[in-house]
Interface confidence: low
């Protein structure tokens, strides 16, 4: 029972974690303008792995994708790769773990097979979580060391002059989402690995006792592993203008809410 609970909880925690990693990867707010260190510009810039956005005052967000691969910093490419690898491994891990769940019967699949699949998915979750944490940490380090190119139109083809004022960027919401999500995936993976040890057939457990000193036998008792981990558990490019005297054309061309931050 405890094994099933541990495995199930590990799966759920990993699922939440991987959803978080996907969300973080897609979010635009990896870096946001540090308002306190740079009060000069009236416009709020924020940047993600895939595009940068400008918030203007009359109610629009303008986001432009990074349309070049070659012009982007190698570290940004590395962060993208780490996050994608994390997502892919996590997704495969989830797929494997679904079939490995003790509560799901698939034909005459033996417990040893389920144990192996649980271990495999657990390792995948651990690596996935580590990839996400590494990716987010590398990006955070880029911000701390001012490696990140800070002008909003540097890679976005927005036109206009590049600001001479070096805008300071600080940690965006996506970094915190990524760290938490990576941590959850990692914890879920560890729980799956723990569950795996209790999933092995009973005779295997007792055989293991005979090969170890009696002091270690307690670790191999069937069902001897309990899981008691408690975890509490877009930027959208939307038109925000809500009315006013302007025509649609005027609104579109006017400085919008999202130019300022």
């Amino acid at each position: 029972m405890a094994v099933t609970a541990c495995q199930g909880l590990g799966f759920v925690v990993s699922l939440i974690g991987i959803a978080g990693i996907i969300a973080a990867t897609c979010m635009d707010q990896w870096s946001t303008q540090d308002l306190y260190n740079n009060p000069v510009t009236a416009v709020f810039n924020y940047q993600g792995l895939w595009r940068s956005c400008v918030r203007e005052s009359s109610g629009f967000t303008e986001c432009r994708g990074y349309f070049t691969l070659l012009g982007l910093p190698a570290m940004l490419q590395a962060v993208r790769a780490l996050m994608i690898v994390g997502i892919v491994l996590g997704a495969i891990g989830l797929l494997v773990s679904i079939f490995a769940l003790k509560c799901i019967r698939i034909g005459s699949m033996e417990d040893s097979a389920k144990a192996n699949m649980t271990l495999t998915s657990g390792i995948m979750f651990i690596v996935s979580g580590l990839c996400a944490i590494a990716g987010v940490s590398v990006f955070a380090n880029m911000l701390v060391t001012n490696f990140w190119m800070s002008t909003a139109n540097m890679y976005t083809g927005m036109g206009g002059m590049v600001q001479t004022v070096q805008t300071r960027y600080t940690f965006g919401a996506a970094l915190f989402v990524g760290w938490v999500a990576g941590g959850l995936t990692l914890i879920g993976g560890v729980m799956m690995c723990i569950a795996c040890r209790g999933l092995a057939p009973e005779e295997t457990n007792y055989k293991a006792v005979s090969y170890h000193a009696s002091g270690h036998s307690v670790a191999y008792k069937p069902g001897g592993f309990k899981a008691s981990t408690g975890f509490g558990s877009n930027t959208k490019n939307k038109k925000i203008y809500d009315g006013g005297a302007r025509t649609e054309d005027e609104v579109q061309s006017y400085p919008s809410k999202h130019d300022y931050v």
Epitope: P39, V40, T41, A42, V43, N45, V54, E56, S57, S58, G59, E62, T151, A152, N153, M158, G159, G160, M161, V162, Q163, I240, Y241, D242, G243, G244, A245, R246, S253, Y254, P255, S256, K257, D259, Y260, V261
Partner: antibody
Framework: QVQLQQSGPEVVRPGASVKMSCKGS????????MHWVKQRPGQGLEWIGM????????RLNQIFKDKATLTVDKSSKTAYMQLSSLTSEDSAVYYC????????WGQGTTLTVSS | DVLLTQTPLSLPVSLGDQASISCRSS???????????LEWYLQKPGQSPKLLIY???SRFSGVPDRFSGSGSGTDFTLKITKVEAEDLGVYYC?????????FGSGTKLEIK
């Protein structure tokens, strides 16, 4: 028709605080910046700051950072500005204006600081 | 802070004449995205200011076409062709590119 209704004139003592309001109608007070502007009698316009009505985030002119506090109540579609430690220099008409282009200004709140 | 210098401070005109008001900024108010957030307002006696021109040259809805804005970088101009009585008041330029946003000192358009 988009309209902004500002609170009535205020007469206060030096050193006191005052909180003026700016109530919107004809649109949703959400997801834009509400600006506040000061105009002393017979003088020009001075930008105080702005508040993002979607999340309460503010940008203040440094001159007013210890003077003005901007807040918003989305449920009542009302933006507020509190002015503290008032002196005669704060006697002025205060305007609220949304959307960044200041197209739809309130009628202004006259503040008189007098002993 | 960006200083906006308006000239002249007072502009006496005859009805039907052309009026021109200059606004010069202490630094470029072209934002990084290429937009220049310079606006012109008219404040009539006892009234709130009203928007005339935004982004240098775009006329706001309902503003007569005798009002036009031009300029770039740091030098901007508001022109009123054939001044009418209803155009009298104080004109302000405003920049919304750099916090703190700033207004010009104002130009009073009056009858000669």
């Amino acid at each position: 028709q988009v309209q902004l209704q500002q609170s009535g004139p205020e007469v206060v003592r030096p050193g006191a605080s005052v909180k003026m309001s700016c109530k919107g109608s004809g649109y949703t007070l959400n997801n834009f910046w509400m600006h506040w502007v000061k105009q002393r009698p017979g003088q020009g316009l001075e930008w105080i700051g702005m508040i993002d009505t979607s999340n309460g985030e503010t940008r203040l002119n440094q001159i007013f950072k210890d003077k003005a506090t901007l807040t918003v109540d989305k449920s009542s579609k009302t933006a507020y500005m509190q002015l503290s430690s008032l002196t005669s220099e704060d006697s002025a008409v205060y305007y609220c204006a949304p959307y960044g282009n200041f197209a739809d200004w309130g009628q202004g709140t006259t503040l008189t600081v007098s002993s | 802070d960006v200083l906006l210098t308006q000239t002249p401070l007072s502009l006496p005109v005859s009805l039907g004449d052309q009026a021109s008001i200059s606004c010069r900024s202490s630094q470029s108010i072209v934002y990084g995205n290429g937009n220049t957030y310079l606006e012109w307002y008219l404040q009539k006696p006892g009234q709130s200011p009203k928007l005339l021109i935004y982004k240098v040259s775009s006329r706001f809805s309902g503003v007569p076409d005798r009002f036009s804005g031009s300029g770039s970088g740091t030098d901007f101009t508001l022109k009123i062709t054939k001044v009418e009585a209803e155009d009298l008041g104080v004109y302000y330029c405003f920049q919304g590119s750099h916090v703190p946003f700033t207004f010009g000192s104002g130009t009073k358009l009056e009858i000669k």
